[in-house]
C-alpha cells in the first residue's frame, strides 16, 4: 500500500548532500565515493544490495588505479582472519580487519566497520569500471566467512543515529557513455537514512522483505504488454527473487526466461532479430535516433503488497531492458544489448529494473518500496509505472521454500 503515514523526523524530506552521489553505468555497476583509514584514503566503492561484505582492493591489480593501503592507516586493526568468496565464475580472497570509514557525500558520520582487504581475485574487478571495492548492503546471513561478520550498514546504524533505511536511484543514461563521460556523468543517488521526495514521482508502494538475507521479495504475476505469462507463480521465485543493484540484467529462472522471450519475440515480430540477440551475444542496431521503441512490449512484475491479498505492479519499458552499447565498428548507429538473461539462482531484479524506479530499502520495517524514478529513460508515449492495488489471492504460495541442507537445523 502507499506510504501515507505521518512524516518521521530524519526519515524523509531533503537529503541534498547525498543527491547525485553515485556514478557509473548499469553494465559495470554504480559506485559511491568512500574513505577508509586515518588519514582517509579515498576509494570508489560499488553499491551492491546483493551481498553483505565491505571489501576493497588492498594490493596492486592491473584493473585498479588505486587500492587500500592498510600500512598507511593508524586506525587499521587486523582481525587475523582470512576470507574467501567464490562465485559461480571468479572469486576474491583477502584478510579481515576493521578501520574507520565514512562517505563524503553521505551522512556526516564516521564508523568503525569490518573491511575485507582483497589480496587476490579472479573475474571480480572490471577493467575501466573505476571502482576499487564493493559495499555489500544486504544482511549478515550472507556475509562471508559467516554471519558473525557485521555488515557495514549494521555497523552504521548501531554506531550512529542514522535510521535503518537507505534508498537508491540508479539513472541509466539511455545512451552509451565512454570513459570520460562516465567520470563526468551523474549516475544516481544513494540516500542513507532516508527518502528524498525529489527523486521520484507518484506514490511509493511497498513489498515485504520475505527473509532478511538477500533483499528477497515475492513476484506473484508477470505480464508482457498486459498479457499474463500464466505460469505457476512459484516459478517466478524459483529458488528466490532478489533486488540486486550489483547485477546488470533482469535475470529470470530458465522456464520464466523462455516464456518471457517467447512473448517478447511475438510482440516485436515486425522485425526479425537474431537468436544471438536474445542470448545477449549479438547487438541490434538502428540508424541513430530511429530505434523503434514502440515495437517492444512493456514488462510488468506484480509484487506482493503489504496487505493480505493485495499486490501492486512495477512496469518497465524497452528503454530499461535494451541496454545501449557503444561499438566503434557500428558507431553511426544506436546499438543495444538485450538485458534480460537466464538464471539458475532465481529472479534477480538488477539495474535493468532498478533504473526505472526509486527503490527504498526500508530495513526498519522489513519492506522494499518502489516509485517511478524521476530520472528514468522513457519516450513521449510510455513511461515506467508503479500501480496498485490489485487483488491477488494465495500469494504466500508463490514463495519457494529452499530445502534446508544444514543438518544442524533439521528437526530430529
Amino acid at each position: 500500500e502507499t506510504d501515507e503515514e505521518p512524516e518521521e523526523p530524519g526519515r524523509r524530506g531533503s537529503f541534498v548532500e547525498m543527491v547525485d552521489n553515485l556514478r557509473g553505468k548499469s553494465g559495470q555497476g554504480y559506485y559511491v565515493e568512500m574513505t577508509v583509514g586515518s588519514p582517509p584514503q579515498t576509494l570508489n566503492i560499488l553499491v551492491d544490495t546483493g551481498s553483505s561484505n565491505f571489501a576493497v582492493g588492498a594490493a596492486p591489480h592491473p584493473f585498479l588505479h588505486r587500492y587500500y593501503q592498510r600500512q598507511l592507516s593508524s586506525t587499521y586493526r587486523d582481525l587475523r582472519k582470512g576470507v574467501y568468496v567464490p562465485y559461480t565464475q571468479g572469486k576474491w580472497e583477502g584478510e579481515l580487519g576493521t578501520d574507520l570509514v565514512s562517505i563524503p557525500h553521505g551522512p556526516n558520520v564516521t564508523v568503525r566497520a569490518n573491511i575485507a582487504a582483497i589480496t587476490e581475485s579472479d573475474k571480480f574487478f572490471i577493467n575501466g569500471s573505476n571502482w576499487e571495492g564493493i559495499l555489500g548492503l544486504a544482511y549478515a546471513e550472507i556475509a562471508r566467512p559467516d554471519d558473525s561478520l557485521e555488515p557495514f550498514f549494521d555497523s552504521l546504524v548501531k554506531q550512529t543515529h542514522v535510521p535503518n533505511l537507505f534508498s537508491l536511484q540508479l539513472c541509466g543514461a539511455g545512451f552509451p557513455l565512454n570513459q570520460s563521460e562516465v567520470l563526468a556523468s551523474v549516475g544516481g543517488s544513494m540516500i542513507i537514512g532516508g527518502i528524498d521526495h525529489s527523486l521520484y514521482t507518484g506514490s511509493l508502494w511497498y513489498t515485504p522483505i520475505r527473509r532478511e538475507w538477500y533483499y528477497e521479495v515475492i513476484i506473484v504475476r508477470v505480464e508482457i504488454n498486459g498479457q499474463d505469462l500464466k505460469m505457476d507463480c512459484k516459478e517466478y521465485n524459483y529458488d528466490k527473487s532478489i533486488v540486486d543493484s550489483g547485477t546488470t540484467n533482469l535475470r529470470l529462472p530458465k522456464k520464466v526466461f523462455e516464456a518471457a522471450v517467447k512473448s517478447i519475440k511475438a510482440a516485436s515480430s515486425t522485425e526479425k532479430f537474431p537468436d544471438g540477440f536474445w542470448l545477449g551475444e549479438q547487438l541490434v542496431c538502428w540508424q541513430a535516433g530511429t530505434t523503434p521503441w514502440n515495437i517492444f512490449p512493456v514488462i510488468s512484475l506484480y509484487l506482493m503488497g503489504e496487505v493480505t491479498n493485495q499486490s501492486f505492479r512495477i512496469t518497465i519499458l524497452p528503454q530499461q531492458y535494451l541496454r545501449p552499447v557503444e561499438d566503434v565498428a557500428t558507431s553511426q548507429d544506436d546499438c543495444y544489448k538485450f538485458a534480460i538473461s537466464q538464471s539458475s539462482t532465481g529472479t534477480v531484479m538488477g539495474a535493468v529494473i532498478m533504473e526505472g524506479f526509486y527503490v527504498v530499502f526500508d530495513r526498519a520495517r522489513k519492506r522494499i518500496g518502489f516509485a517511478v524514478s524521476a530520472c528514468h529513460v522513457h519516450d513521449e508515449f510510455r513511461t515506467a509505472a508503479v500501480e496498485g492495488p490489485f487483488v491477488t489471492l494465495d500469494m504466500e504460495d508463490c514463495g519457494y521454500n529452499i530445502p534446508q541442507t544444514d543438518e544442524s537445523t533439521l528437526m530430529t
Epitope: 553494465g27 559495470q28 559461480t88 565464475q89 573475474k123 572490471i126 577493467n127 575501466g128 522485425e271 526479425k272 532479430f273 537474431p274 537468436d275 544471438g276 545477449g280 551475444e281 549479438q282 547487438l283 541490434v284 542496431c285 561499438d327 565498428a329 557500428t330 546499438c335
Partner: antibody, heavy 116, light 107 residues
Framework: EVQLQQSGAELVRPGTSVKLSCKAS?????SYWIHWVKQRPGQGLEW???????????KYNQKFKDKATLTVDTSSSTTYMHLSSLTSEDSAVYYC?????????WGQRTLVTVSA | DIVMTQSQKFMSKSVGDTVSVTCKAS??????VAWYQQKSGQSPKSLIY???HRYSGVPDRFTGSGSGTDFTLTISNVQSEDLADYFC?????????FGGGTRLEIK
C-alpha cells in the same frame, strides 16, 4: 583501438592436441563474446563456437563439440581454444573474432599444421 | 543448419566497373546477414552488417541489399585493391554459417 592478438603458428603431430590463444585489447573484455572460425586452404569459413567472457558460457557448432574446447582468462583478457585428437583434417587457419553485430573484429590468424 | 550459397565462385571486372556478388540463404534469415572481404593471406575484414549497413570506415562504394533469402553485395567503381574473396554470413541462428566465397579478379 580494438585488437585481437592470436598466438603463433603450430606444427603438431597427429593424435596430439594444441591450445590456441586470442588476447583482446581496446575494449571491455567481458562485454562481448569471442568466436572461433576455421578456414581450410582454398575453402570457406566454418564457425566453431563462441564463449561469453563474463561467465564462461559456451556454445558450439555440433560439428566441433568433441574437437574444440573454449576457455577464458579474464585477468589477461585472453580466450583459448583447445583442439584435441588432431588429424590432417584439423590442418587449417583459425581465427578468433569478436561479437557485436555479426563479427566486426577479427584476429590476425593462427596456422595449425598437423603432420607426422 | 542454414546453407548460404554463393553461386558465382569467380568474377572478373575492370577498374571502374560495378560488380554484384549474390548470396542465397536456404531459409529466411531476415536481414541478419554480414559481408566480409578477405585478401590473400589476410584475415577477413568486416564490410556490411544487417544486410545493408556499412561498418565504420568502409568506403561507400560497398553497398549491401536484400532480406529474407536473397542478398547482394554491390561494389561500384571497382578498384585494384578490391581484389579479394568476398564471403556472406548469416548470423540469424546457430550455428552461424558462411557462403563458400566469391573471388573478385581485376582484369
Amino acid at each position: 583501438e580494438v585488437q585481437l592478438q592470436q598466438s603463433g603458428a603450430e606444427l603438431v603431430r597427429p593424435g596430439t592436441s594444441v591450445k590456441l590463444s586470442c588476447k583482446a585489447s581496446g575494449y571491455t573484455f567481458t562485454s562481448y563474446w569471442i568466436h572461433w572460425v576455421k578456414q581450410r586452404p582454398g575453402q570457406g569459413l566454418e564457425w566453431i563456437g563462441m564463449i561469453d567472457p563474463s561467465d564462461s558460457y559456451t556454445k558450439y557448432n555440433q560439428k566441433f563439440k568433441d574437437k574444440a574446447t573454449l576457455t577464458v582468462d579474464t585477468s589477461s583478457s585472453t580466450t583459448y581454444m583447445h583442439l584435441s585428437s588432431l588429424t590432417s583434417e584439423d590442418s587449417a587457419v583459425y581465427y578468433c573474432a569478436r561479437s557485436g553485430v555479426a563479427f566486426p573484429y577479427w584476429g590476425q590468424r593462427t596456422l595449425v599444421t598437423v603432420s607426422a | 543448419d542454414i546453407v548460404m550459397t554463393q553461386s558465382q565462385k569467380f568474377m572478373s571486372k575492370s577498374v571502374g566497373d560495378t560488380v554484384s556478388v549474390t548470396c542465397k540463404a536456404s531459409q529466411d534469415v531476415g536481414r541478419n546477414v554480414a559481408w566480409y572481404q578477405q585478401k590473400s593471406g589476410q584475415s577477413p575484414k568486416s564490410l556490411i552488417y544487417s544486410a545493408s549497413h556499412r561498418y565504420s570506415g568502409v568506403p561507400d562504394r560497398f553497398t549491401g541489399s536484400g532480406s529474407g533469402t536473397d542478398f547482394t553485395l554491390t561494389i561500384s567503381n571497382v578498384q585494384s585493391e578490391d581484389l579479394a574473396d568476398y564471403f556472406c554470413q548469416q548470423y540469424n541462428s546457430y550455428p552461424y554459417t558462411f557462403g563458400g566465397g566469391t573471388r573478385l579478379e581485376i582484369k
